[in-house]
């Protein structure tokens, strides 16, 4: 038996009862997997909100855009998308919200055209260091990935391995230097407390970096110097207190960067003076007139651009004999 062929003008759906029959035989070039909708004209397959527990084996060879969102995949094994013949055209793969908690080494191997990958909204307790590089070689074959979307992939506290979540993600990004061509990286909403200092230096092609809605307190040890192509840096909704001179100078030196800093708890004391001076001068920060102080209490809601040096003082540190308990 064969599933209905996809029409050039609309999506076709396969009947669920055909699933077992189809998966046992080699895929026909134009067939559509059970529980999926296919459009050959749009080169698109959508298997959305179907509670799938594994990636369909009988994906059509023409697929360029594959949506596997809202499923229950749990684990993405090595070669999860390896097929004979390979899915040579697959360029965009969206796996968001599919309850993935483990992505194994080589999960995306044999996808030579894969440019966009979205793993957002999956509780990734176990992301293999070789999930994107495919091998444990010190230098892997370059990945074709240009966009990697990893928003809200942090698992609940009780499901985390006994290791740094930031470190696990960064290890996967840096393994084998496979992602040298990556242009967009989204890591929003991941409870990141810090950014490992080596991560950005090894992603030299980045154009867009989204670190919004994390818990970053400082950028002191992060270097942006090599990111000469960076166009947008999203740091909204973090825990940043101040940006220091080294960071300011590096950002100022990037020729077409736009930095977004809204909704951080800026501490408007004497350490903020350099940042305020820079903000008044720079074109780098978008919406800079919206930035306000959070601390100290007497400065709350004051607009950073309206502050002058007299406003930015630090309370003197009392000698121990004068401090109260």
């Amino acid at each position: 038996s064969s599933s209905p062929t996809s029409s050039a003008s609309s999506f076709s759906s396969s009947a669920p009862f055909l699933a077992s029959a189809v998966s046992a035989q080699p895929p026909l070039p134009d067939q559509c997997p059970a529980l999926c909708e296919c459009s050959e004209a749009a080169r698109t397959v959508k298997c959305v909100n179907r509670n799938l527990t594994e990636v369909p084996t009988d994906l059509p060879a023409y697929v360029r855009n594959l949506f596997l969102t809202g499923n229950q995949l749990a684990v993405l094994p090595a070669g999860a998308f390896a097929r004979r013949p390979p899915l040579a055209e697959l360029a965009a793969l969206n796996l968001s919200g599919s309850r993935l908690d483990e992505v194994r080494a080589g999960a995306f191997e044999h996808l030579p055209s894969l440019r966009q990958l979205d793993l957002s909204h999956n509780p990734l307790a176990d992301l293999s260091p070789f999930a994107f590089s495919g091998s444990n070689a010190s230098v892997s074959a370059p990945s074709p990935l240009v966009e990697l979307i990893l928003n809200h992939i942090v698992p609940p506290e009780d499901e985390r391995q006994n290791r740094s979540f930031e470190g696990m993600v960064v290890a996967a990004l840096l393994a084998g230097r496979a992602l040298q061509g990556l242009r967009r990286l989204e890591l929003a909403s991941n409870h990141f407390l810090y950014l490992p200092r080596d991560v950005l230096a090894q992603l030299p092609s980045l154009r867009h970096l989204d670190l919004s809605n994390n818990s970053l307190v400082s950028l002191t040890y992060v270097s942006f110097r090599n990111l000469t192509h960076l166009e947008s840096l999203h740091l909204e909704d973090n825990a940043l207190k101040v940006l220091h001179n080294g960071t300011l100078a590096e950002l100022q030196g990037l020729p077409h960067i736009r930095v977004f800093l809204d909704n951080n708890p800026w501490v408007c004391d004497c350490h903020m003076a350099d940042m305020v001076t820079w903000l008044k001068e720079t074109e780098v920060v978008q919406g800079k007139d919206r930035l306000t102080c959070a601390y100290p209490e007497k400065m709350r809601n004051r607009v950073l651009l309206e502050l002058n040096s007299a406003d930015l003082d630090c309370d003197p540190i009392l000698p121990p004999s004068l401090q109260t308990s």
């Epitope: 020729p255 001076t277 008044k280 001068e281 074109e283 978008q286 651009l305």
Partner: antibody
């Protein structure tokens, strides 16, 4: 009402110097970056120079780099363009404009600079 | 340097016509593009900023679209006061602006 008024244009010989001024009113001058843009007779617009709100950052078009200097006096609400080593191809109407995040949202009426012997 | 190329260089149209002017950048500039109108002997006036945002006070018959390298300015129904020269301008690089060569819109 935002107003920008250029002055200082005129006839100057090749190799000579001229200083243009732009008096600003109707907005908080020290809060805005500013730019100079020029337009040769019968030609299109050419961006010339940029200065940040407190003068810490400046930039220039390649065609004027090393010859023109942009500056500002926030206490006088005035923008300047010092033009040295003038050439015939610098002949143009020079406009000052308020620069807001890459957008030139207000312009003066311009002052004509003629470089000729 | 980023080059901006406008087309056509000149255009004849009648009152009430729908007119489209295009601007092409020599590399991707995201949405960092503005449009200006200039009438003879006058300073340029900002119409559209950030590719598609209408400047306050500008009639709604003006609209802008595009991103990357290709942009358009559209006047939905030409009015007598719209006959002028139109310029696009990019601001992808901080502090380094470039204009298109202009499109002269004339009465047919």
């Amino acid at each position: 009402e935002v107003q920008l008024l250029e002055s200082g244009g005129g006839l100057v010989q090749p190799g000579g110097s001229l200083r243009l001024s732009c008096a600003a009113s109707g907005f908080t001058f020290s809060s805005y970056a500013m730019s100079w843009v020029r337009q040769a007779p019968g030609k299109g617009l050419e961006w010339v120079s940029y200065i940040s709100s407190y003068g810490g950052y400046t930039s220039y078009a390649d065609s004027v780099k090393g010859r023109f200097t942009i500056s500002r006096d926030n206490s006088k609400n005035t923008l300047y363009l010092q033009m040295n080593s003038l050439r015939a191809e610098d002949t143009a109407v020079y406009y000052c404009a308020r620069y807001h995040s890459g957008v030139l949202d207000y312009w003066g009426q311009g002052t004509l600079v003629t470089v000729s012997s | 340097d980023i080059q901006m190329t406008q087309s056509p260089s000149s255009l004849s149209a009648s009152v009430g016509d729908r007119v489209t002017i295009t601007c092409r950048a020599s590399q991707s500039i995201s949405s960092y593009l503005n449009w200006y109108q200039q009438k003879p002997g006058k300073a340029p006036k900002l119409l559209i900023y950030a590719a598609s945002s209408l400047q306050s006070g500008v009639p709604s018959r003006f609209s802008g679209s595009g991103s990357g390298t290709d942009f358009t300015l559209t006047i939905s129904s030409l009015q007598p006061e719209d006959f002028a020269t139109y310029y696009c301008q990019q601001y992808y690089y901080h502090y380094l602006l470039t204009f298109g060569q202009g499109t002269k819109l004339e009465i047919k």
